[in-house]
């Protein structure tokens, strides 16, 4: 019978008695930076080339005995998970292993750096097809390791890493905290986050998605036909490396940004029990479990978007938080969130020739998050239109006035400490979908984009009585690009996108009187690209 | 996922003009920074990655490494260049006493220095 983990990542249309999805990643080379491996294991024999690269520290302790099977156990298992004949994800992928971890599974940042450099030099000397680099390791936050990962990613290499097994914020570890790396947390057969001893999988905004990582059957270095169950975020990362190899084999021209967006898009949504995570991390942690796409082609027509959370701003009065999209992505909207509700909104601003999303803390606030909606929109030309505070009773409004530009997101930012205590909120006049409306004391920012075939529409869901959460979702075929709250009153904690749903959070109902100010409206901007759909049909 | 994350210790050693009369002294006002792992048991003091500014060529990296060795020797310290980086990041890996950090941070082209640390199988 098919192991649970392979079943979990396989879309129903592939599921038969045997796990045999089309094309097993044969055009892709996967580099594994790990322990030594047993390359003659029947699972991986002929699939893994052991390079001559080795950079490991001495083993700790005077009584440590090097036992070949122990030295090879981690790397052999992971190689099997990626490309093993019986229990592998991408059975056609070829692999190259570099030894950066010793027999105790310990390495150094410097050894890992030299390994990454080795891969880059190999790539330059002998360019091959798409490259995936699997980093099933973690150390403390390292600026230099993150920088090296960034450089390698910008050279067109897909890096996949373990989130870490420390039951902690993945942003405190490297390479997990590197934005360019695909960071993977671990879940079990019950879609619960994995517990490992007293600890478990890492979580938080630096995790891109989760994958099977508990009780994973794979090649054992005990003998050439042995199997063993191992667990950890390394195993989860190996699944994603395998899925990435499959996707890149089907579409070798995919960029890192496109691959990441597809991984997110085809993941199982909202299946993880979030109660396992610390309360303050639940909103930041993606509820996504990796899966193979249902077919290898035909995803190109979709408008892909993802949500990127910033680091926490900190509590000082003028503190700000910045969320950035990847170089190949467009920032289509910007929102903010504060657990205390004390914030001064958000704005999109240019930084180094690219738009970023900046959120502003307010006096007495515990800090804010900026939330960017980052999308793949080829040939896009986006700009931000700003209207200063109107001071008029009708409130502030701004629209996309350029021909062919459509509204993809609305942001509002205010200087006053407590918006909404002065005047009742204003609501958008109906029939004007291409404009953002906000409080009269706020400046309003409209994200306006022109792209071939791009069309957008506004969808609202209002609740007259106070409610802790109001949501509105885009329908099938449309993608959420913008998420904001109407009105920008003081009891709104903020707005953010979860997959294709716009979520507006308010203060605890018990602390909010059921006045008219209790009314909260979630505003979603839903877009699609007719151009991408046509291009896809022409290809087929 | 950002580079500004919190629990990461940063030690900024401001540059002062000293007796070393460097041929390629850093531009006035720039400060190279020193970083080390926030998790103390994972630190590996005595080995440092010296990262140079982005456009630094391999020959400049080698020259900077040699200059560090020469200046350290003048102070009676032994250093060993373990690796010179090029291809991904310009810089070098050096085994040296932590006493030399202030000196190393003043070298030309230096962007930052990071103390080596452990990574673990997950």
């Amino acid at each position: 019978s098919i192991p649970w983990n392979l079943e979990r990542i396989t879309p129903p249309r592939y599921r038969a008695d045997e796990y045999q999805p089309p094309d097993g990643g044969s055009l892709v080379e996967v580099y594994l930076l790990d322990t030594s491996i047993q390359s003659d294991h029947r699972e991986i024999e002929g699939r893994v080339m052991v390079t001559d690269f080795e950079n490991v520290p001495e083993e700790d302790g005077t009584r440590f005995h090097r036992q070949a099977s122990k030295c090879d156990s981690h790397g052999t298992h992971l190689a099997g998970v990626v490309s093993g004949r019986d229990a592998g994800v991408a059975k056609g992928a070829s692999m190259r292993s570099l030894r950066v971890l010793n027999c105790q599974g310990k390495g150094t940042v410097s050894g890992t750096l030299i390994g990454l450099e080795f891969i880059r030099k190999s790539q330059l000397v002998q360019p091959v097809g798409p490259l995936v680099v699997l980093l099933p390791l973690a150390g403390g936050y390292s600026r230099v390791l993150n920088a090296a990962c960034q450089r390698l990613a910008r050279a067109g290499v897909v890096l996949v890493t373990a989130a870490g097994n420390f039951r902690d914020d993945a942003c405190l570890y490297s390479p997990a905290s590197a934005p360019e790396v695909i960071t993977v947390g671990a879940t079990n057969a019950q879609d619960q986050p994995v517990t490992l001893g007293t600890l478990g999988t890492n979580f938080g905004r630096c995790v891109d998605l989760f994958a099977p990582g508990e009780d994973i059957i794979g090649a054992s270095s005990d003998c050439s036909t042995c199997f063993v169950s191992q667990s950890g975020t390394s195993q989860a990362a190996a699944h994603v490396a395998g899925i990435a190899a499959m996707m890149l084999s089907a579409e070798p021209e995919l960029t890192l940004a496109e691959l990441r967006q597809r991984l997110i898009h085809f993941s199982a949504k909202d299946v993880i029990n979030e109660a396992w995570f610390p309360e303050d991390q639940r909103v930041l942690t993606p509820n996504l479990v990796a899966a193979l796409p249902p077919s290898t082609h035909g995803a190109g027509w979709q408008l892909f978007c993802r949500t990127v959370w910033s680091a926490h701003s900190g509590p000082t009065r003028m503190a700000t938080a910045v969320a950035r999209c990847a170089p190949d992505e467009e920032l289509l909207s910007c929102s903010s969130f504060s657990r205390s509700g004390k914030r001064r909104g958000e704005r999109m601003e240019a930084q180094g020739g690219k738009l970023v999303c900046r959120a502003h803390n307010a006096f007495g606030g515990e800090g804010v998050y900026a939330i960017a909606r980052c999308c793949l929109l080829p040939q896009a030309n986006c700009s931000v239109h700003t209207a200063p505070p109107a001071e008029a009773s009708m409130g502030t409004r701004v629209h996309c006035h350029q021909q062919g530009h459509v509204l993809t997101g609305c942001s509002s930012h205010w200087e006053v400490e407590d918006l909404g205590t002065h005047k009742p909120p204003v609501l958008r006049p109906r029939g004007q979908p291409n404009q953002c409306v906000g409080h009269r004391e706020a400046s309003i920012h409209a994200s306006c984009c022109h792209a071939p075939g791009l069309e957008c529409k506004v969808k609202e869901h209002g609740i007259p009585a106070p409610q802790e959460q109001v949501t509105v979702a885009c329908e099938e075929g449309w993608t959420l690009t913008g998420c904001s709250a109407l009105p920008g009153t003081s009891h709104v904690l903020g707005a953010y996108a979860v997959d294709n749903t716009c979520v507006v959070r308010s203060r605890d109902v018990s602390t909010t009187g059921s006045t008219s100010e209790g009314a909260v409206t979630a505003v979603a901007i839903c877009c699609r690209s007719r151009h991408l759909a046509q291009a896809s049909q022409e290809l087929q | 996922q950002e580079d500004e994350d919190g629990d990461y210790e940063e030690l900024v050693l401001a540059l002062r003009s000293e007796e070393d009369g460097l041929a390629e002294a850093p531009e006035h006002g720039t400060t190279a920074t020193f970083h080390r792992c926030a998790k103390d048991p994972w630190r590996l003091p005595g080995t440092y990655v010296v990262v140079l500014k982005e456009e630094t060529h391999l020959s400049q990296s080698e020259r900077t490494a040699r200059r560090l060795q020469a200046q350290a020797a003048r102070r009676g310290y032994l250093t060993k260049i373990l690796h010179v980086f090029h291809g991904l990041l310009p810089g070098f890996l050096v085994k040296m006493s932590g006493d030399l950090l202030e000196l190393a941070l003043k070298l030309p082209h230096v962007d930052y220095i990071e103390e080596d640390s452990s990574v673990f199988a997950q």
């Epitope: 019986d86 490992l196 009780d215 994973i216 199997f227 191992q230 | 199988a121």
Partner: antibody, heavy 130, light 107 residues
Framework: EVQLVESGGGLVQPGGSLRLSCAAS????????MSWVRQAPGKGLEWVAN????????YYVDSVKGRFTISRDIAKNSLYLQMNSLRAEDTAVYYC???????????????????????WGQGTTVTVSS | DIQMTQSPSTLSASVGDRVTITCRAS??????LAWYQQKPGKAPKLLIY???SLESGVPSRFSGSGSGTEFTLTISSLQPDDFATYYC?????????FGQGTKLEIK
């Protein structure tokens, strides 16, 4: 679905020998430790022995040490219990069971996490009597 | 060797009752304890592992707690299918021992 099927039980005289077999299906067999557990008539469960995936480590309850030998054949997906010098008190239903557990790394140490015996055979009866 | 003592040996209860079975270890076993259910003529079935983790497919009315030397299995609302014998089992460096069992019968 993993299935375990025991065979080889029967009536044997004290001092005699018997070899129990347990046939398993799928690669999951070779991925876990395996155990033999017995249950004397009207009594509780008693763990007898277990064996590592590759057969390199074996453990026994004190009462059978030196008399019973656990082994496995990965190629045949089979587990065995060779029982020698049988005594009347060895009379029981013998179950083979899969010891589900997993290995994981944490800061340079390789650890084992045990879940329990999650798959059991239907049992085979051994009667030791003259 | 570690001894496991279950109490009570027999427990009479009715459908809908909340019942608790206790298991004591002769020395600390951390959380390395599993609970099994066995019906006459059948093989045991794993219910709980690592003291409190519910095995896949087991109804949520079953729960486990405890660590060190004292452990409990609780059935929040007895169903007709729950009348059986229950065993605890400790795991300690690859050798195991079971408790003597608790027979849960209809009152």
């Amino acid at each position: 679905e993993v299935q375990l099927v025991e065979s080889g039980g029967g009536l044997v005289q004290p001092g005699g020998s018997l070899r129990l077999s347990c046939a398993a299906s799928g690669i999951t067999f070779s991925s876990y430790w395996m155990s033999w557990v017995r249950q004397a008539p009207g009594k509780g469960l008693e763990w007898v022995a277990n064996i590592k995936q590759d057969g390199s480590e074996k453990y026994y309850v004190d009462s059978v040490k030196g008399r019973f030998t656990i082994s496995r054949d990965i190629a045949k997906n089979s587990l065995y219990l060779q029982m020698n010098s049988l005594r009347a008190e060895d009379t029981a239903v013998y179950y083979c069971a899969r010891d589900r557990g997993t290995y994981y790394y944490q800061q340079g140490s390789y650890n084992y996490y045990y879940y329990g015996m999650d798959v059991w055979g239907q049992g085979t009866t051994v009667t030791v009597s003259s | 060797d570690i001894q496991m003592t279950q109490s009570p040996s027999t427990l009479s209860a009715s459908v809908g009752d909340r019942v608790t079975i206790t298991c004591r270890a002769s020395q600390s076993i951390s959380s390395w304890l599993a609970w099994y259910q066995q019906k006459p003529g059948k093989a045991p079935k794993l219910l709980i592992y690592k003291a409190s983790s519910l095995e896949s497919g087991v109804p949520s009315r079953f729960s486990g707690s405890g660590s060190g030397t004292e452990f409990t299995l609780t059935i929040s609302s007895l169903q007709p299918d729950d009348f059986a014998t229950y065993y605890c089992q400790q795991y300690n460096s690859y050798s195991y021992t079971f408790g003597q069992g608790t027979k849960l019968e209809i009152k």
